[in-house]
Interface confidence: medium
């Protein structure tokens, strides 16, 4: 079987939420059973199409309604021919969208006026991703390349911080971290606390 992908480049870039149809052309077989594979695993999709072009030329379609990050990867199609599995050239599907947070600022409890750090990291594609920091409704830092660490010299009351990630597709806002004041035991002084409270909280990838 002469197997080739047609109508799609080797690298395909699609925006998150958009549909995509991958095509696979099979020549030299009368009744190919075309299966799509993503990163080594057969793709289950009940609506895969076979279109006969001629007796020995078929096109298989794989239709994705709304791509998300988890759809990104390497796709190819395969057919069995005389006990042998023939595979096509792959298509690399890249899914672009607004930045996705891998690290967001974490709630903290710190003594009054004690320095602390908050961390924020977001990824594309597309890259680069830049980070802007907010204290309440006031922009206090950035834009800076992701990942970004915000060094705060101290707070005297409970304060809210968040970060914003920007790329060519738009922006995403992180969770809001609340930095609470820690009660300081009597007889000790807040400015003796010079250790940093580091935040590197990460959450699992959300499905759309």
């Amino acid at each position: 079987a002469g197997l080739k992908l047609m109508g799609a480049p080797v690298k395909l870039t699609v925006s998150q939420g958009q549909p995509v149809k991958l095509n696979c052309s099979v020549e030299g077989m009368e009744e190919p059973d075309i299966q799509w594979v993503k990163d080594g695993a057969v793709v289950q999709n009940l609506d895969q199409l076979y279109i006969p072009v001629s007796e020995q030329h078929w096109i298989g379609f794989l239709s994705l309604k709304s791509v998300e990050r988890s759809d990104a990867g390497r796709y190819w199609c395969q057919v069995e021919d005389g006990g042998e599995t023939e595979i096509s050239q792959p298509v690399w599907l890249t899914v672009e969208g607004v930045p996705f947070f891998t690290v967001e600022p974490k709630d903290l409890a710190v003594p009054p006026n004690a320095p602390f750090q908050l961390s924020c990291e977001a990824v594309g594609p597309p890259e680069p991703v830049t980070i802007v920091w907010w204290r309440g409704t006031t922009k206090i830092g950035g834009p800076a390349p992701s990942p970004s660490v915000l060094n705060v010299t101290g707070v005297t009351q409970s304060t809210m911080f968040s970060c914003e990630a920007h790329n060519l597709k738009g922006l995403a806002s992180s969770r809001t971290a609340t930095v609470h004041l820690q009660l300081v035991p009597r007889g000790s002084s807040a400015h003796h606390h010079h250790h940093h409270h580091h935040s590197a909280w990460s959450h699992p990838q959300f499905e759309k």
Partner: antibody
Framework: EVQLVQSGADVKKPGASLTISCQAS????????ISWVRQKPGKGLEWMGQ????????NYGPSFQGHVTISADRSTATAYLQWRSLEASDTAMYYC??????????????????WGPGTLVTVSS | SYELTQPPSVSVSPGQTARITCSGD??????AYWYQQKSGQAPVLVIY???KRASGIPERFSGSSSGTMATLTISGAQVEDEADYYC???????????FGGGTKLTVL
């Protein structure tokens, strides 16, 4: 002209085995998969499963996995739905369904469907 | 197992717009299809891939999908549109398909 001809109505006792058929004509049988759909009296449609005739690859709905078997005979262009042991709750109309796609000059295909007329299966003691 | 949820019934007067909804967690990722079934007949495909009208279906039928909700709209419903309507889609991984419970449309 595309046709899906289903076997006639059948009455069986609980515990009996049964195979109903769906014979396709007017197109190349192996080009498209065939699905089976159940409709109990006065109730809604239920997707049972499907078969890709060219490879005899099957998918089943969770409620039907292990209770029915879908198969196909390429030589007679016929799809089958089989029970080893019928229950009263299997009383229903069973439809076979064939999707198909047509292209205009090789562009994105347009989707069509053919439904068989249905086979009424009654399971009663 | 995966479910698609539809309202059991919708009633409109002739000429009014009827909207039938179908909700399912996988609908952001999987296409919705709509079927019409009149009493004693086999179902007929009305809408495929969320919004494409099937061959021979009047223009007053349209489909849309947003998030976890698909909607079949009949603009200017006719008495002959009285039927049961079913949505159909796949579970998220594409291993099997399901129908919604069906909606009885009454055009009074």
């Amino acid at each position: 002209e595309v046709q899906l001809v289903q076997s006639g109505a059948d009455v069986k006792k609980p515990g009996a085995s049964l195979t109903i058929s769906c014979q396709a004509s007017g197109y190349t049988f192996t080009d498209y998969w065939i699905s089976w759909v159940r409709q109990k009296p006065g109730k809604g449609l239920e997707w049972m499963g499907q078969i890709v005739p060219r490879a005899s690859r099957t998918n089943y709905g969770p409620s039907f996995q292990g209770h029915v078997t879908i198969s196909a005979d390429r030589s007679t262009a016929t799809a089958y739905l089989q029970w080893r042991s019928l229950e009263a709750s299997d009383t229903a109309m069973y439809y076979c369904v064939r999707p198909y796609f047509q292209t205009s000059g090789g562009t994105i295909p347009e989707y069509y469907q053919h439904w068989g007329p249905g086979t009424l299966v009654t399971v009663s003691s | 197992s995966y479910e698609l949820t539809q309202p059991p019934s919708v009633s409109v007067s002739p000429g009014q717009t009827a909207r039938i909804t179908c909700s399912g967690d996988a609908l952001p990722k999987k296409y919705a299809y709509w079927y019409q079934q009149k009493s004693g007949q086999a179902p007929v495909l009305v809408i495929y891939e969320d919004e494409k009208r099937a061959s021979g279906i009047p223009e007053r039928f349209s489909g849309s999908s947003s998030g976890t909700m698909a909607t079949l709209t009949i603009s200017g419903a006719q008495v002959e549109d009285e039927a049961d309507y079913y949505c159909y889609s796949q579970e998220r991984n594409g291993n099997y398909a399901v129908f919604g419970g069906g909606t009885k449309l009454t055009v009074l």
